[in-house]
Amino acid sequence: IVNGSDCQKDAQPWQGALLLGPNKLYCGAVLISPQWLLTAAHCRKPVFRIRLGHHSMSPVYESGQQMFQGIKSIPHPGYSHPGHSNDLMLIKMNRKIRDSHSVKPVEIACDCATEGTRCMVSGWGTTSSSHNNFPKVLQCLNITVLSEERCKNSYPGQIDKTMFCAGDEEGRDSCQGDSGGPVVCNGKLQGLVSWGDFPCAQRNRPGVYTNLCEFVKWIKDTMNSN
């Protein structure tokens, strides 16, 4: 997150981190039920760990943290790397969470977001596009949903109904390491961090997010059948 601010501890209890090795964060994720996460399909890796209930970027133990393995990764069938359409994936964890003030699921929005809606995006991704700077703790950023027209003007030929754009003035954006993390609007999960221009946080090049209202049925059906 570029030019966000430290999230309040436990204010984003659905925020997850996908880790490689002992503690290398490569993507965010969102807890949507006691045993299921959503993330971006492009975050798929054969082996990874899941961390919930953690505030700090560092691996220091926190009392609220819970660690999991992913036992099933189910990318949306319409996703095709390296395209950006249908960029979502369900992850089934090896066990259910212990519900606590630090770890709670978020409800997915059934209605699509409208232009001007204020939302919050969060993550432990880079705080500048030099790709070296990481935050000490989870970052939060208020962003505004942009019109479809403005979104398509920003990225001609690259936007479809499985995406929406959101941003703020130049210098505020999600960035590398935030993928798969939550965009929460009015208390409901509206999107996942997906893509945007490189470097992050450029004028007229907003963040692009997976439009979850288009996938509510697929998410429910997939969880029920697995």
Epitope: G21, H131, W195, F198
Partner: antibody
């Protein structure tokens, strides 16, 4: 078959210009960032330039900045390198290479260059 | 710019030998290192990405390890087709930089 084929190399005098081309086939070219990498005779690999999938981000090695220009035409599945003010030290085999890292995606994960052309030779000599 | 230093610059080995090549970055690059193999007159070939992940089609005798600034490429049992020059490359930060190369020669 995924393939990159370079062309446009040749002998040029110092101060002269050349335009290299790289024709891509067998994959969706518009989805991938691309690079030019060169190798002087008997030397190691040197990265020259990078262009993102949509051409929105471009970068160059200091040794070629202001003299070389990278571009692409996604409709033609082609990558280009315009080389001006050529010097003797630009003599090398020039490779185009596909970058597996999608820098538009906002994951923190980096790969490398997975597909390379056969190279085209540029000789700068009087 | 990040400097990549490879050692040794050349190594003589026999078929069946275990060969280890090291690469050091001038600043931390986490696990974001690639290894390439290049044979004379040919283009480089990606062997390993993300320090330890084997590229599709690459034999399992090749392995990579390391994180931060120090990395290693190991060929567990050298085969005749492995005699080549090997390069490391840091991939997260522009400008991309390569190591100077390690030539693996027949003893």
């Amino acid at each position: 078959e995924v393939q990159l084929v370079e062309s446009g190399g040749g002998l040029v005098q110092p101060g002269g210009s050349l335009r290299l081309s790289c024709a891509a086939s067998g994959f969706t070219f518009e989805h991938y960032s691309m690079n030019w990498v060169r190798q002087a005779p008997g030397k190691g690999l040197e990265w020259v330039s990078y262009i993102s999938s949509s051409s929105s981000y471009i970068d160059y090695a200091d040794s070629v900045k202001g003299r070389f220009t990278i571009s692409r035409d996604n409709a033609k599945n082609s990558l280009y390198l315009q080389m001006n003010s050529l010097r003797a030290e630009d003599t090398a085999v020039y490779y185009c290479a596909r970058d597996l890292t999608d820098r538009q995606s906002r994951d923190y994960y980096y790969y490398g260059m997975d597909v390379w052309g056969q190279g085209t030779t540029v000789t700068v000599s009087s | 710019d990040i400097q990549m230093t490879q050692s040794p610059s050349s190594v003589s080995a026999s078929v069946g030998d275990r060969v280890t090549i090291t690469c050091r970055a001038s600043q931390g690059i986490s696990s974001w290192l690639a290894w390439y193999q290049q044979k004379p007159g040919k283009a480089p070939k990606l062997l390993i990405y993300a320090a330890s992940s084997l590229q599709s089609g690459v034999p399992s005798r090749f392995s990579g390890s390391g994180s931060g600034t120090d990395f290693t490429l190991t060929i567990s049992s050298l085969q005749p087709e492995d005699f080549a020059t090997y390069y490391c490359q840091q991939v997260p930060i522009f400008p991309y930089t390569f190591g100077g190369g390690t030539k693996v020669e027949i003893k």
